[in-house]
Structure formats: C-alpha cells, structure tokens
C-alpha cells in the first residue's frame, strides 16, 4: 500500500470499520501543506478532507468517517492543484479491528474460558496468548468468536493472558492489521493477580507490514 509517486509513501488504516486514516510521508514536500481529496464512488466529485492530521505544523494525513463501508476509496493528495499521489483502494483490505473489551475469565479446574465482547462484524479471529514464567514463549489459541477455552493449565502456576482480534486473511486479504492487545491479566489458582513474578514484557504487535 505504500507505493511511491513523486516520493510519496502512504499508509491506510481502516479502524474498526468506522474511521479511515490515510497518512503520507513525502520528503520532497516536508514543509508543504498537501491537501487530501477523496470520494467513495467513482462517479462523485471529490470532497476535501476536513479532519487533517498534522506533523510539525504541516498536514500528514486525513481521518475520514466511513462507518461499515465496503467501498473503494478514491483519493488524491495534492500540492495546490497539482496531484502528487492519486490512487484507489478497497478500504476493508486495511482493516484494523478495535482492541478486545470486557475480557472475562471463567475457571474450571485446569481450564479457563476467555470471553470478550464480539465485534459487530464478522470474519474475525479472536486470539488469546498466554504463558507462565516457566514458559519460554507465548502459547496461542484462537477462535471465530470471542469464546476461547484453554485446557491443561497447571493450577499452581501463574499465567499471563492477553487477547487480540485479527481479520481473516481469506476474506480481508493480507494487508490488514491485528488489533492492539488487550490489557495483560494475570491469574493463579483461579484468582486474579497483580502480576506474575518474572514474566517478561510481551512483545508489542507490529503495526506496519
């Protein structure tokens, strides 16, 4: 998605099928207020962005309200009247689901069921990662709904859990972004803990491809 025209790099993120963020990096125009023009239908006239992102006082992106739209975004980044980058993209290819909310844990001896509020749209994977201080890496389990049961846990160990949402690649394509991780929650013997001793900080998910 970062194809260059006149040295312009762009990034598109469609946040939770609600807001599209298009950002640009154009070293040639670093001190210029480039303008962003867009339309959701190839036949319409272009609208100009009304909600710019600024970096060091100059335009660097645009935020567009685009709730639940399965549309092509046609856009043009301009220096005055001169287009420096023009493209069209399916917005859903750049979906980033929102971070899981209302994460809940129900324990049954050596198993835990992790639930959270399902997002309002489908074709998603809800991934739970977990580990104890004795594990060298994170274990992972994912389901199509936010109802993931993990079995075979050691009741005496403290486990850290977190959850994220991913768009299914066979539906949305390879260029989507996983959600941010939920807060880390620690559990031992079915009881919530403030922390698990000696648990390293989990790696942050990569935003850009």
């Amino acid at each position: 998605q970062g194809g260059a025209a006149e040295g312009v790099q762009i990034q598109i993120i469609y946040f939770n099928l609600e807001t599209v963020q298009v950002t640009w990096n154009a070293s040639k125009y670093s001190r210029t207020n480039l303008t962003f023009h867009y339309r959701f239908n190839g036949d319409e006239a272009y609208d100009q962005c009304t909600n710019y992102l600024l970096q060091e006082g100059h335009t660097s992106g645009c935020l567009l309200d685009a709730e639940q739209r399965d549309d092509i975004l046609y856009f043009s980044i301009r220096n005055g009247t001169h287009p420096v980058f023009t493209a069209s993209r399916w917005m859903v290819y750049y979906l980033k689901p929102s971070s899981p909310k209302h994460v809940r844990f129900s324990w049954h001896q050596d198993a835990v069921t992790v639930t959270c509020s399902d997002l309002s749209y489908g074709d998603l994977l809800y991934e739970v990662q977990y580990r104890s201080p004795f594990d060298t890496e994170w274990q992972s389990k994912q389901e199509n709904t936010c109802n993931v049961t993990i079995e075979g846990l050691d009741a005496e160990k403290c486990y850290s859990f977190w959850v994220r949402v991913k768009a299914m690649e066979d539906v949305y394509g390879p260029d989507t972004y996983p959600s941010d991780w939920s807060e880390v929650t620690c559990w031992q013997r079915g009881e919530i803990r403030d922390a698990c001793a000696e648990t390293p900080t989990p790696p942050k998910p990569k935003l850009s491809k």
Partner: antibody, heavy 123, light 107 residues
C-alpha cells in the same frame, strides 16, 4: 486527584432531547484501557447503567435504551457527552458519570463517580 | 440480562455491630461483583471490586466474599458514617446491572 462533574438542563418537556456533559480531570481518555460510563437513578430507586465509551472510541450501550442513546467524547477537552432522544417522564432521574477503574486489568468497575445531575421531565 | 437481587431493601443495626448485606445473581458471574456505597447526599463510592478486593482508601472494616451466584458485603464495627445505601453490581456480562440496594440504618 480524579474528579468528574455532570451538567445538564435540569428540566425538559416530554419528547425533547437530553444532552448531558461529563467534565473530568485527573486522568485522560487517551490512556489505553480507560473509559467513562453513564449511570442513572430515578428518585428512590436503583442504579441503571446506560452507556460506556472507551479510550479508542468503542461504545457500549444498554440494549433496552440503545435506540435513544448516543455517547461521545472530546478527549482534548476532557469531556464525555450523552444524548437521550425523545425523553419521557420515566427518564426523570439523577444522572451520574463514572470512570472505568483501571486498578486491575480487565476488571470493569467504576472507581470514581461524579456528584450527579438531576433531570425532571414534565409537561 | 443478569438480574441482581438484594433481598433486604433496608437493614437496621446498632453502632458497633457487624452487618452482612447479601446479593444474588440470576446466573454465575465468576466473581465479577462490585460493591458501592451511596451516601444520603447521593455521593457514590466504590468499596469492593472483583468480590473481595478492597478499593484503595477504603477502610478494612469493609470486606466482601462469595462465588458463583451468591455474594456478600460485611461491615464490621458499624459507625454513624456507614449509614448509606449499598449496591452490588455485576461486571460479568453486558449490560452491567445493579442490585436494588440495601439501605442501612441505625437502631
């Protein structure tokens, strides 16, 4: 310290739209995990959760009132808003805003509350 | 929706008493139970979260217990300043719901 304060019109007529503002300080809705909710209490009755907005603009509503409710925020001004359309006398209540506690991750409770603002709906 | 029931709507006790207020959920809420205190002037404070965890600044005279569907709040050595209405709230499933409240009075 954390403080929240609600403001509203005080009196409305049936079918009008209620607009409430929660102004807060001592925390930021830019912080991951943070949220603010609205709860109401008719005089002499129990508490009813209405809506909740999260740091990333996710919104949750009580399904029994969802068609009437809109929650929004202005992060830069430390404010959260609630609109209730087409109010009726049954909407007469004290309306509270409250912060989602962040002391333990994924345990949702409201750790700080405003003092409440009273609404009377009367023709 | 999960119904939260506080069967005792008002409770009368003497200063110095130990008082227990109960709350029942219509289904298992896996310990996601919070307790709030509402003073006569309307001020609301969180006392206990996740069944038994004391919110910061809350005196240790307040304690919570329970599991599954049955939960309780205990206040030891009752004082005048404890006169209030106490509400339970489940945070397990949306919509979050509250009990009807138990009003605590002095004999």
């Amino acid at each position: 310290q954390v403080t929240l304060k609600e403001s509203g019109p005080g009196i409305l007529k049936p079918s009008q739209t209620l607009s409430l503002t929660c102004s807060f300080s001592g925390f930021s809705l830019n912080t991951s995990g943070m949220g603010v909710g609205w709860i109401r209490q008719p005089s002499g009755k129990g508490l009813e959760w209405l809506a909740h907005i999260w740091w990333d603009d996710d919104k949750y509503y009580n399904p029994s009132l969802k068609s009437q409710l809109t929650i929004s925020k202005d992060t830069s001004r430390n404010q959260v808003f609630l609109k209730i359309t087409s109010v009726d006398t049954a909407d007469s209540a004290t309306y509270y805003c409250a912060r989602r506690a962040s002391h333990v991750s994924t345990v949702d409770s409201f750790d700080f509350w405003g003092q409440g603002t009273t609404l009377t709906v009367s023709s | 929706d999960i119904q939260m029931t506080q069967t005792t709507s008002s409770l009368s006790a003497s200063l110095g008493d130990r008082v227990t207020i109960s709350c029942r959920a219509s289904q298992d809420i896996s310990n996601y139970l919070n307790w709030f205190q509402q003073k006569p002037d309307g001020t609301v404070k969180l006392l206990i979260y996740y069944t038994s965890r004391l919110h910061s600044g809350v005196p240790s005279k307040f304690s919570g217990s329970g599991s599954g569907t049955d939960y309780s709040l205990t206040i030891s050595n009752l004082e005048q300043e404890d006169i209030a209405t106490y509400f339970c709230q489940q945070g397990y499933t949306l919509p979050w719901t509250f009990g009807g409240g138990t009003k605590l009075e002095i004999k």
